[in-house]
């Protein structure tokens, strides 16, 4: 589809005569009829197969034809066609005299013809005008012509339809040959495929508009080259989507088991030393002068019970002072004025006189010590438990509670790996550098999840007078370790003073 355009430029008829030689009265009021048809070697009358057009009266005798494309499109003359331009044509241009206002062929006498020209040849589609001049005996016509494609038609013969668009079906303009030219940011045969952000990962990323980078599930970041850890992951990372690779100090499927409580929480106060002892478990070793689970309590000078033989301690600004019971003296009431006659030995101790009755010595039964057998034996003072094991007093004996990865009476043996499925009751086994660790299901505890969770007998704080409470794991009962000066299963009785 296109348009044959004919631009009339100048017509010369100096004598103002018709083709017959007869002059026009008063002058030749001239208009043109144009016929465009298929190529003929000899142009003959017949249908104007490519179209025809007539002009109004353009002038009298000789005149120049001005451009009038804005005023109704009369010059250049437009001969549209809706077929593929064949590249050849025949053109007939007739100049006629109009005696009156009616320019219809049937209203004109046949001798009103002024001149007739006919040309034929090849013509390629293009913007350039071809200039031509045809001269007869009495007239001369100067004109130019061209063939251009209609809007949205392109190519050598105006046969390629191309309509620019910028919507879901394409984003392009049209090149002169009718090929699509994608708008910036689009590609593909019909320019429907956006060009993603530069560097957007080919597999992990995609885009729905130019310069975008949207990530497929499991990927994140500007270029979709960072993975997303598993939904349940707590303290882990990934190298592929949905992984959970634990950070240092964390364990478990979702990296939610704290294997390094000391580092993560710094629970020990006042410069104490922290030791990890399993999942969310730790032990604080206090500096002198501090006590408590987290070494949060500051000891007074009297907290070490320095006064012997039932002496009472009084804190002073510059230290402490012991008030000795009758029969004792010295800085710590360590010297006795008593003899065996005064029954100074407690807890069933037997008295032996020394220095001809001037002093005495107590022989204590098992589990008791001190110059008057007033102290319960602490069998853990020698730190017998190896590998960070916790020592527990158990009446006349002691036992070691081992850290994960160790076993034996004194935690002296290193447990091997998890190959033997050592965790009971569905416990999960973890191989650690320090040995293995069992993560127990609810209701079970112990190094191998072998113990049904027992009650904490010390939870009710049954021991009096700042005594230390221990749970006897074999009987689920408590044992109180009394401070100096107190006795009884709950340390509820003060030590009786010997008779003076």
């Amino acid at each position: 589809s296109g348009v044959f355009q004919l631009q009339l430029q100048e017509f010369v008829n100096e004598r103002g005569v018709l083709a017959s030689g007869r002059p026009c009265e008063p002058g030749c009021r001239t208009f043109f009829r144009v016929c465009l048809k298929h190529f003929q070697a000899v142009v003959s009358p017949g249908p104007c197969t490519f179209g025809s057009v007539s002009t109004p009266v353009l002038g009298t005798n000789s005149f120049a034809v001005r451009d009038d494309s804005s005023g109704g499109g009369r010059n250049p003359l437009q001969l549209p066609f809706n077929f593929t331009w064949p590249g050849t044509f025949s053109l007939i241009i007739e100049a006629w005299h109009a005696p009156g206002d009616d320019l219809r062929p049937e209203a004109l006498p046949p001798d009103a013809l002024i001149s007739k020209i006919a040309i034929q040849g090849s013509l390629a589609v293009g913007q350039n005008w071809l200039l031509d001049e045809q001269t007869s005996t009495l007239t001369r016509l100067r004109y130019s012509y061209r063939v251009i494609c209609s809007d949205n038609y392109y190519g050598d013969n105006c046969s390629r339809l191309c309509k620019k668009r910028n919507d879901h079906f394409g984003h392009y303009v049209c090149q002169p040959d009718g090929n699509l030219s994608c708008l910036p940011g689009w590609t593909g045969e019909y320019c429907q495929q956006p060009i993603c952000l530069s560097g957007c990962h080919e597999q992990n990323g995609y885009c729905s508009k130019p310069a975008e980078c949207l990530c497929r599930p499991g990927w994140q970041g500007r270029l979709c080259n960072e993975c997303i850890p598993h939904n349940g992951c707590r303290h882990g990372t990934c190298s592929t989507p949905w992984q959970c690779t634990c950070d240092e100090g964390w364990g478990g499927l979702f990296c939610d088991q704290d294997l390094n409580y000391c580092t993560h929480h710094s629970p020990c106060k006042n410069g104490a030393t922290c030791s990890n002892s399993g999942q969310r478990s730790y032990t604080c070793t206090c500096r002198p002068g501090y006590t408590g689970v987290d070494c949060e309590l500051e000891l007074s000078e009297c907290d070490s019970n320095p006064c012997r033989n039932g002496g009472s301690c009084k804190d002073q600004e510059d230290g402490y002072h012991c008030l000795c019971p009758p029969g004792y003296y010295g800085l710590h009431c360590e010297h006795s004025t008593l003899s065996c006659a005064d029954s100074p030995c407690f807890n069933g101790g037997s008295c032996r006189e020394r220095n001809q009755g001037a002093s005495y010595a107590c022989e204590c039964p098992p589990n008791f010590t001190g110059s008057n057998c007033e102290k319960k034996v602490d069998r853990c003072t020698s730190n017998p438990c190896a590998n960070g094991g916790q020592c527990l007093n158990r009446g006349p004996s002691r036992m070691c509670r081992c850290r994960p990865g160790f076993t034996g009476t004194y935690c002296e043996r290193h447990v091997s790996d998890c190959a033997r499925n050592p965790c009971a009751h569905g416990g999960t086994c973890h191989d650690l550098e320090s040995g293995l660790m069992c993560t127990c299901p609810a209701g079970f505890s112990g190094r191998r999840c072998e113990v049904r969770t027992s009650i904490d007998a010390c939870a009710s704080s049954p021991c009096f007078n700042r005594a230390t409470c221990y749970t006897d794991l074999s009987t689920d009962t408590f044992v109180c370790n009394c401070p100096y000066g107190f006795v009884g299963s709950r340390c509820e009785f003060p030590v009786g003073l010997p008779p003076s």
């Epitope: 990530c215 497929r216 599930p217 990927w219 500007r222």
Partner: antibody
Framework: EVQLVESGGGLVQPGGSLRLSCAAS????????MAWVRQAPGKGLEWVAT????????NYRDSVKGRFTISRDNAKSSLYLQMNSLRAEDTAVYYC???????????WGQGTLVTVSS | DIQMTQSPSSLSASVGDRVTITCRAS??????LAWYQQKPGKAPKLLIY???NLADGVPSRFSGSGSGTDFTLTISSLQPEDFATYYC?????????FGQGTKLEIK
């Protein structure tokens, strides 16, 4: 235990601004992408914005683009939503969540109410 | 944007009942679908992800199935604490979108 605690909601006039904050704990914040999801009173859930773990790429729903800005401070384990040019239709409970636009929202905060009204 | 349509919008059931909620996507979302539970005045809680994977701590009476465009959440034996509103969500296509919700009420 994973905890996400939002703050900063309140009553604001149309055209006004508000900054929401979300304090995260119980997980290694810097490893995970984060999001804001909102719920208008009596309505359903609507994704608002996400940010990748490395803080290099935010995404927004079309209706808040150019008005809202999501950001994070990995050192403080905190997520933020700066809301400008607020409209009545932005009225909602805003939830801080751990997740991305292409993954489930695994953990949620308790929400903070934003009311835009004159 | 992908439209997510849940049915029914509301549902009455009794403790011990087996309950099914469906979710339909306007186009293929493969298995990239999650289910959430929300109780009044509370935040949503992830129940199921990737169509059929139970989130941590979610009881086994909850299960999910489906693929492509049609998905189902099933509660095998309803418990008193299960009465809530349930939402599906797709995360296959940008932007992520939620269903309108299904309110599960006690009969």
């Amino acid at each position: 235990e994973v905890q996400l605690v939002e703050s900063g909601g309140g009553l604001v006039q149309p055209g006004g601004s508000l900054r929401l904050s979300c304090a995260a704990s119980g997980f290694t914040f810097r490893h995970f992408p984060m999001a804001w999801v909102r719920q208008a009173p009596g309505k359903g859930l609507e994704w608002v914005a996400t940010i990748s773990s490395s803080d290099d790429w935010p995404n927004y729903r079309d209706s808040v683009k150019g008005r809202f800005t999501i950001s994070r401070d990995n050192a403080k384990s905190s997520l933020y939503l700066q809301m400008n040019s607020l409209r009545a239709e932005d009225t909602a409970v805003y939830y801080c969540s751990r997740g991305y636009y292409n993954s489930p929202f695994a953990y949620w905060g308790q929400g903070t109410l934003v009311t835009v009204s004159s | 944007d992908i439209q997510m349509t849940q049915s029914p919008s509301s549902l009455s059931a009794s403790v011990g009942d087996r309950v099914t909620i469906t979710c339909r996507a306007s186009e293929d979302i493969y298995s990239n679908l999650a289910w959430y539970q929300q109780k009044p005045g509370k935040a949503p809680k992830l129940l199921i992800y990737d169509t059929n994977n139970l989130a941590d701590g979610v009881p086994s009476r909850f299960s999910g199935s489906g693929s492509g465009t049609d998905f189902t959440l099933t509660i095998s034996s309803l418990q008193p604490e299960d009465f809530a509103t349930y939402y599906c969500q797709q995360y296959n296509n940008y932007p992520p979108t939620f269903g309108q919700g299904t309110k599960l009420e006690i009969k």
